[in-house]
């Protein structure tokens, strides 16, 4: 079947080998020639010719293909010049001849036993697979080819992705490092409790890929979505030479969704023990998992167990508010955090959702702050707080917001980094309720924002400014 | 023009040999083609017998039991049918044919009558 | 051994009739089948090769066809000179095998 995959061979006796232990020669007759008409006569350098058996098999509306797979291993050498011969039994000619290389007539089998499931980020894919030839992976260079998969239309897009797959692991990274800092102190980073805008994923689902022998991590799909995807392999060129061989198999896979479309939001108190909340569905149960891992890289044959997240009871403070599903778990500040929620519809089906993963101390959440005021003059207020952490107050930073009552509209400050209180200016004679958060946000410490504090009801009398 | 002759007795005993000459003409038997003996029994029955290539390898009928044997003179151009231990069943009239670029008997000889009878 | 079965021996014909004379082999020759025509007293000619090609000088109101198992040889339009016996043989594997025959004579 491979044979087309040999379409830019212009030899008319065409030769692969599989493994680079074995060898297959072929070539096509017009001619409708006895069977036996010929031999394939072969040599290496000063030894004497011999003949490789042959098989043939018809070919409707063309002729005959005639095959020889070479008997024994010993007579596939590498780097060795290969002469090869056709010679028709009854008439005196040579029908064709070549000189090759075994180790540049590669045609690699396909990757098998491919293995697909979501990777540790949404949207993350990672497969891995087993090379039929062990021995010659590490001189093989892998290309994938996938696309969504569309349950009604089995043809799938027009544009499917081939990418080359020269290396594995993206530099081994913290998930969400806290770039955050370049921008304003309290600017929102893409947190795994963020629920931040959704990317829209371009028609030609850009994507990146990485890969080692036998496993590979694709990033940039789209989190719930379903996936097909092939391999193939083909020789490096280094040290071996040849073709790309048949794809695999097309495996489908299905990614998890992406926490973010559940509300997903972890956090610690303690730098101990992890909360992780997210909007309860109707008509649904949930469940959440988790699991630790070392280093954020493709984890070769080796695919997480996740533990339960144990429940806590769910909540519902307003009608307004949706109601959360909550639970907990002990964790760990040396490793990473992978959370997974597993939504079961009354039908049975269960959907999962994903969370980004992160470092403990990158989901501290503060306890609320205590707001204090006194007015200095007029409508002159000042503002004090206690930092909820004095071991990280250069990287807490604040929002204060207020609104006249009777307004529906807040007006929110950011104080500077670090803080520890300011003044305000209000309208006067005039009703304000005024609320403070916290959150960390620093090169140590990361996390959510605390819950705002109770309002603080005042009644000043002149105009706002800082 | 390519043509071929057969000659050898016209009569041979049971469980002798019987011997055939096949005298090829304007085509030298070593540059090219396969050269054939083909026998047609008296109920017109044809029996491919075997051949000699150009290069003087041999291919023979199963049926005829190893009785038979093909072999040739390159200096007279000639090639030969022995087959031995023959039967009445042997009488037939035997041609020489050439094998050609389609591997098909496209020249053959006028034939030569065989009666085996004691 | 391939068994090459002509199912007619012989055949009465008129001189203009479309002639078909079939042959049948007892496994798939992969159209390694030839068409001999002999007179009386002559050897065979070879008239067609790889089951439909007309060899160099014989008249085109002779074709083949077939495939597989089943061959045909027609004359569209019988000649007085095409009367004779007229073979098949396989020379797919060996040992090569000839058809019975079939002869023609006119009426």
């Known amino acids: 079947q491979d044979v087309s995959l040999l379409a830019s061979d212009s030899e008319p006796l065409k030769c692969f080998s599989r493994t680079f232990e074995d060898l297959t020669c072929f070539w096509d007759e017009e001619e409708a020639a006895p069977s036996g008409t010929y031999q394939l006569l072969y040599a290496y350098p000063r030894e004497k010719p011999r003949a490789c058996p042959l098989s043939s098999q018809s070919m409707p509306h063309f002729g005959t293909r005639y095959v020889c797979q070479f008997p024994d291993q010993e007579e596939v050498r590498l780097f060795f010049p290969l002469h090869l011969w056709v010679k028709n039994v009854f008439l005196n000619q040579t029908r064709t001849q070549r000189v090759l290389f075994v180790d540049s007539v590669g045609l690699p089998a396909p990757p098998s036993i491919i293995k697909a499931m979501g990777g540790s980020q949404p949207g993350e894919l990672q497969i891995s697979w087993e090379e039929p030839a062990p021995e010659i992976s590490d001189f093989l260079r892998y290309e994938l080819r996938y696309g969504p998969r569309d349950p009604k239309n089995s043809t799938g897009p027009t544009v499917i992705q081939l990418i080359a797959t020269e290396t594995c692991c993206p530099a081994l990274q913290r998930p969400h490092s806290a770039s955050a800092l370049d921008q304003s102190p309290c600017a929102q980073p893409t947190m795994p409790w963020q629920d931040g805008p959704k990317q829209t994923s371009p028609s030609r689902e850009a994507s990146a890929l990485t890969a080692e022998g036998g496993s590979c991590l694709i990033s940039g799909l789209q989190p719930g979505n379903s996936y097909w995807l092939q391999l193939r392999s083909e020789p490096d060129g280094i040290s071996l030479g040849g073709s790309w061989g048949s794809w695999s198999l097309p495996v489908t896979v299905d990614l998890p969704g992406d926490a973010v479309a559940l509300g997903l939001q972890c956090f610690t108190l303690d730098l101990k023990n992890v909360t992780c909340q997210w909007q309860q569905q109707d008509h649904a149960s949930s469940q959440g998992f988790f699991y630790h891992s070392r280093a954020r890289c493709c984890p070769r044959d080796r695919y997480p167990i996740w533990e339960n997240c144990e429940e806590e009871e769910k909540t519902n403070p307003g009608l307004q508010t949706p109601q959360f599903s909550r639970c907990h778990f002990k964790s760990r500040n040396d490793s990473i955090i992978h959370i997974l929620v597993e939504v079961t519809t009354a039908p049975g089906t269960v959907h999962s959702y994903l969370g980004s993963p992160f470092w403990i101390h990158q989901a501290v959440r503060l306890p609320t702050p205590n707001l204090h005021w006194r007015e200095i003059s007029s409508g002159h207020l000042e503002l004090e707080w206690q930092h909820p952490s004095s071991w990280a107050a250069q990287e807490t930073c604040y929002q204060l917001r207020y609104t006249g009552e009777g307004h529906q509209d807040w007006k929110v400050l950011e104080p500077p980094l670090g803080a520890r209180g300011g003044t305000l200016e209000l309208r006067p004679r005039s009703r304000y309720r005024l609320q403070l958060r916290a959150r960390l946000n620093g090169p140590t410490y990361q996390g959510p924002w605390s819950s705002w504090s109770d309002p603080t009801r005042v009644e000043t009398a002149t105009e706002t400014a800082w | 023009d390519v043509q071929l002759q057969e000659s050898g007795p016209g009569l041979v005993k049971p469980s002798q040999s019987l011997s055939l000459t096949c005298t090829v003409t304007?085509?030298?038997?070593?540059?090219?083609?396969?050269w054939n003996w083909i026998r047609q029994f008296p109920g017109n029955k044809l029996e491919w017998m075997g051949y000699?290539?150009?290069?003087?390898?041999?291919s023979y009928n199963p049926s005829l039991k190893s009785r038979n044997s093909i072999t040739r003179d390159t200096s007279k151009n000639q090639f030969f049918l022995q087959l031995n231990s023959v039967t009445t069943e042997d009488t037939a009239t035997y041609y020489c044919?050439?094998?050609?670029?389609?591997?098909?008997?496209?020249?053959w000889g006028q034939g030569t009558s065989v009666t085996v009878s004691s | 051994d391939i068994q090459m079965t002509q199912s007619s021996s012989s055949f009465s014909v008129s001189l203009g009739d479309r002639v078909t004379i079939t042959c049948m082999a007892s496994?798939?020759?992969?159209?390694?089948l030839a068409w001999y025509q002999q007179k009386p007293g002559n050897a065979p000619r070879l008239l067609i090769s790889a089951a439909t090609s007309l060899e160099t000088g014989v008249p085109s109101r002779f074709s083949g066809s077939g495939s597989g198992k089943d061959y045909t040889l027609s004359i569209t339009s019988l000649q007085t000179e095409d009367v004779g016996t007229y073979y098949c043989?396989?020379?797919?594997?060996?040992?090569?095998?000839f058809g019975g025959g079939t002869k023609l004579e006119i009426n």
């Open positions: 044919a050439r094998l050609g670029r389609r591997y098909t008997m496209d020249y």
């Open positions: 043989q396989q020379y797919w594997s060996s040992p090569w095998t």
């Open positions: 000699i290539t150009y290069s003087g390898s041999t």
């Open positions: 304007g085509y030298s038997i070593t540059s090219d083609y396969t």
């Open positions: 496994e798939d020759i992969y159209i390694r």
